[in-house]
Interface confidence: medium
């Protein structure tokens, strides 16, 4: 599944966000705007959009050029430079901006609803409109088989540049060299190269205390191609937010902070360092080994279908899950599922360009993973794919254009955590990571968000199973894992993200960070939220009418345990509906491999897998985390 | 400039088994996939399967299942393909392939097998 | 699997002249996930075009590609001397990926 998020129209010029994070390729580009019946704006196009009141916090691909319009100076859009600020090299993915010469010449909100040009395809794409209208439809609009099969979970959005750089203006233009540590796959690639799966594992717990647990996993590339046709409607919601990469690294975390590319950075980074790696669409290269983003994966359709769990549900991301995955990146694949996103708004819909780029909540979990090294998960697509950034990516309403739909922002309100998890560097084991992360919300919701943020609690989850099983196989670990996950308010992450893009390269880089993406509503970060902060709310349960749900979500505090402190909080539907998040037949890669057919049912709520104790398996070892009582 | 350069032609017996070398350069080896596709005298060409470089998994084409066995070295940005239980019929040209249509050269130049008694 | 079969097998033209190559899938390839290469005498394949219709990178505009569903065409507007050599198509909707049995385009 694919989510287009897409902005208003500036003249003819829209940006267009897929999955909630950079995963798009300049091929991609060419053809996502082709279906949109578009182009890619030229530079005149663009800034005769950026003259009538077009701005976004994201770098998306124009022609010859990949730019952040900027209006307004924002420190951690286009570094504070105001016009088409340019990223000089663009090796990587992106998002894209398209030029509909039919459009009015003045603004355009009016929702966009299907995508004219998209040829017969089995993917089911949405476009989310910045009102938060969806509208899905079945096709496809890739060409490039690269984009379509990226085989690296390729951190695509790996490459950032540090925090170092800083942009140089020439000719009126911004040039931004974007340092990317990881060349993404080419943009024009066609057959699948991507490689890695990355597969997160993920640990959803219900509030009941009964630990669900689903592995999901990057999907493999080709597998491949069943999976890419894999329906993704099945699979809902994974209400999976927390994530916390124990990859291996003692570190925890260090906050990660706005810089002048986050924009870009926070998509590609996550940080995480890895030898090289892949968007993960998406997603999406092979190794984990490079700062996988946190879902990234993929790219592409992987990326999408891949760890979206309840991308589409805001609900999800109020609950808070925790994804651990001791996996040894290279070997699962399992890609559990694709959650279709389509079922619910998404929380926010990205222009949560700024918010993108800033990435403040450093709210850095504590995880001391087994391993290693450190991954440092940028929030941004925490949610990967689809998501559409729900708590990422709100963007801070510095892009005019990006409005967060209402359905949205409330949602958003409670959306206590998000998390990602990012692949690891190559061979690591620990490369899931729990990110927590405090959901923005609309900026009526700011209380909301921080929501207890001063108690902090945590669930420590032992896990029950044969530690060897956990998520996702550690393949290196040999001992007992015991998680714990440690936020609290008073964890002050230092924000300072130096280091996180340029310990791309490093494999034991990995900080967590949660990073705060603005409210929703477009407002630039409240400043007084403790952006650090995971909001965890304390037995705090909160009712989505347009789902007619409510989730509850446990108090989570932080314990902190030795070295392999991964914690998980997961907080699920009361219901316990978490299983419901994967299902669909799924083959999935083993490290040995292999790759086998897991079958789940969307009817059983279960994915399948043994279900004892609630906890799914899916394809994929995982540990059951249990909570103590 | 992405370049793939592959090991020396190969003499075999049948029965044996051979182990083709490919390098990359010009890219970050593990962000991308590895194919290998074969072509035997004056026939068309065959994909045998690909190796996800980041993670090491593989998928086979049902042909060469339980003969051929795609590896990497991440460390050396080196991909490998060993077939074992030669045939005279494995005798071909075998390329790895990074499938995409950038500029460089995607595919190696190729590695002669030769399987003869 | 999906088998592509090419038409012809020889096609003997002259420079200038227009080559108009066939593949026909054995059954529909998914999303148009048709790709041409070009293959000369000891030399590797080199990809042409992708997705049907979409031109790799440095390929020149004369070769252009269409078709969808079971029946793809390679068309060289304007055969250039350089462009004598056999032409594979290639699906890689499904696995396993496959190719045609080539076309070879001679010089006449």
């Known amino acids: 599944q694919i989510d287009l998020n897409i902005t208003c129209r500036f003249a003819g010029v829209f940006h267009v966000e897929k999955n909630g994070r950079y995963s798009i390729s300049r091929t991609e580009a060419a053809d996502l705007c082709k279906a949109f019946n578009s182009t890619l704006p030229t530079m005149a196009q663009m800034e005769k959009a950026l003259s009538i009141g077009f701005e976004t916090c994201r770098y998306g691909f124009i022609e010859g050029h990949v730019v952040i319009p900027r209006i307004h100076p924002n420190s951690i859009c286009a570094a504070n430079n105001t016009g088409v600020y340019i990223l000089t090299s663009n090796t990587s993915q992106y998002d894209t901006y398209c030029f509909n010469a039919s459009a009015p010449p003045e603004e355009d909100c009016t929702s966009v609803t299907d995508l004219p040009n998209a040829f017969d395809g089995p993917i089911t794409i949405t476009i989310v409109n910045r009102d938060g209208t969806r509208y899905v439809q079945k096709g496809e609009y890739r060409t490039n088989p690269e984009d379509i099969y990226p085989s690296n979970p390729t951190d695509d959005d790996v490459s950032s540049g540090s925090s170092s750089e800083r942009s140089s203006t020439s000719g009126g233009y911004i040039f931004y060299t974007f340092s990317t540590v990881h060349p993404i796959p080419d943009e024009d690639s066609p057959w699948i190269t991507d490689s890695t799966d990355r597969i997160p594992a993920t640990t959803l717990m219900s509030t009941s205390a009964t630990a669900t647990e689903t592995a999901t996993k990057r999907q493999e590339t080709w597998d491949w191609f069943s999976w890419l046709f894999l329906p993704s409607e099945s699979k809902n919601h994974l209400h999976t937010t927390t994530q916390m990469a124990g990859t291996s690294s003692n570190t925890i975390s260090a906050g990660w902070e706005p810089n002048e590319e986050n924009e870009d950075e926070r998509d590609r980074h996550l940080s995480f360092s890895g030898s090289g790696i892949d968007d993960d669409e998406d997603f999406i290269s092979s190794t984990i080994s490079t700062t996988p983003r946190a879902f990234d994966h993929t790219k592409q359709n992987q990326d999408w279908t891949q760890w979206n769990p309840s991308h589409s549900n805001p609900e999800v991301l109020l609950q808070t899950t925790t994804r651990m995955t001791d996996v040894d990146r290279n070997g699962t694949t399992a890609y559990e599922g694709n959650w279709n996103p389509e079922a619910h708004p998404p929380l926010i819909h990205h222009e949560h360009h700024e918010e993108e780029e800033t990435p403040h909540s450093t709210s850095t979990i504590q995880a001391t993973p087994s391993s290693t090294t450190e991954e440092t998960a940028t929030q941004k697509e925490q949610w990967f794919g689809n998501r559409w950034h729900e708590g990422y990516r709100q963007t801070p309403k510095e892009d005019s254009h990006s409005t967060t739909g209402t359905a949205a922002a409330s949602a958003h309100t409670s959306h206590p955590m998000q998390g990602r998890t990012t692949p690891s560097p190559e061979d690591s084991s620990w490369t899931d990571f729990f990110n927590p992360i405090s959901h923005p919300m609309g900026r009526g919701h700011q209380a909301g968000r921080r929501m207890d943020m001063d108690s902090s609690h945590s669930i420590t989850l032992q896990p029950t199973a044969n530690p060897n099983t956990g998520l996702v196989e550690d393949l290196d670990r040999t001992g007992p894992l015991s998680m714990t996950t440690q936020q609290s308010n008073s964890q002050s992450f230092s924000t300072s993200h130096e280091g996180l893009e340029e310990d791309k390269d490093h494999p034991t880089t990995s900080t967590l960070t949660s990073s705060n993406r603005n409210d929703v509503t477009g407002g630039r970060r409240d400043p007084n939220h403790s952006e650090g902060s995971t909001t965890l709310l304390e037995g705090y349960t909160s009712h989505y009418p347009h789902t007619k749900e409510s989730r509850t979500f446990i108090p989570v505090t932080s314990a902190k345990t030795g070295s392999f402190g991964v914690t998980a909080v997961t907080v699920g539907d009361s219901n316990s509906n978490v299983n419901r998040s994967l299902s669909g037949d799924q083959d999935t890669f083993h490290p040995s491999g292999g790759s086998h057919t897991t079958h789940g049912s969307e009817s059983d709520g279960h994915s399948h897998g043994s279900q004892e104790g609630g906890a799914n398996t899916t394809s994929g070892p995982i540990r059951t985390p249990q909570i103590p009582e | 400039q992405v370049q793939l350069v592959q090991s020396g032609a190969e003499v075999k017996k049948p029965g044996a088994s051979v182990k083709v070398s490919c390098k990359a350069s010009?890219?970050?080896?593990?962000?991308?996939?590895m194919h290998w596709v074969r072509q035997a005298p004056g026939q068309r060409l065959e994909w045998m399967g690909w190796?996800?470089?980041?993670?090491?998994?593989?998928k086979y084409s049902q042909k060469f299942q339980g003969r051929v066995t795609i590896t990497r070295d991440t460390s050396a940005s080196t991909a490998y393909m060993e077939l074992s239980s030669l045939r005279s019929e494995d005798t071909a040209v075998y390329y790895c392939?990074?499938?995409?249509?950038?500029?460089?050269?995607?595919w190696g130049q190729g590695t002669l097998v030769t399987v003869s008694s | 699997e999906i088998v592509l079969t090419q038409s012809p097998g020889t096609l003997s033209l002259s420079p200038g002249e227009r080559a108009t190559l066939s593949c026909r899938a054995s059954?529909?390839?998914?999303?148009?996930?048709l790709a041409w290469y070009q293959q000369k005498p000891g030399q590797a394949p080199r990809l042409l075009i992708y997705?049907?219709?979409s031109r790799a990178t440095g390929i020149p505009d004369r070769f252009s590609g269409s078709g969808s569903g079971t029946d793809f065409t390679l068309t060289i507007s304007r055969l250039e001397p350089e462009d004598f050599a056999v032409y594979y198509c290639?699906?890689?909707?499904?696995?396993?990926?496959?190719f045609g049995g080539g076309t070879k385009v001679e010089i006449k």
């Open positions: 392939a990074r499938f995409y249509s950038g500029s460089g050269s995607p």
């Open positions: 010009g890219y970050t080896f593990t962000n991308y996939a």
């Open positions: 190796i996800n470089t980041g993670n090491g998994n593989t």
């Open positions: 059954q529909s390839v998914s999303s148009s996930y």
């Open positions: 997705g049907a219709s």
């Open positions: 290639q699906q890689y909707g499904s696995s396993p990926l496959t």
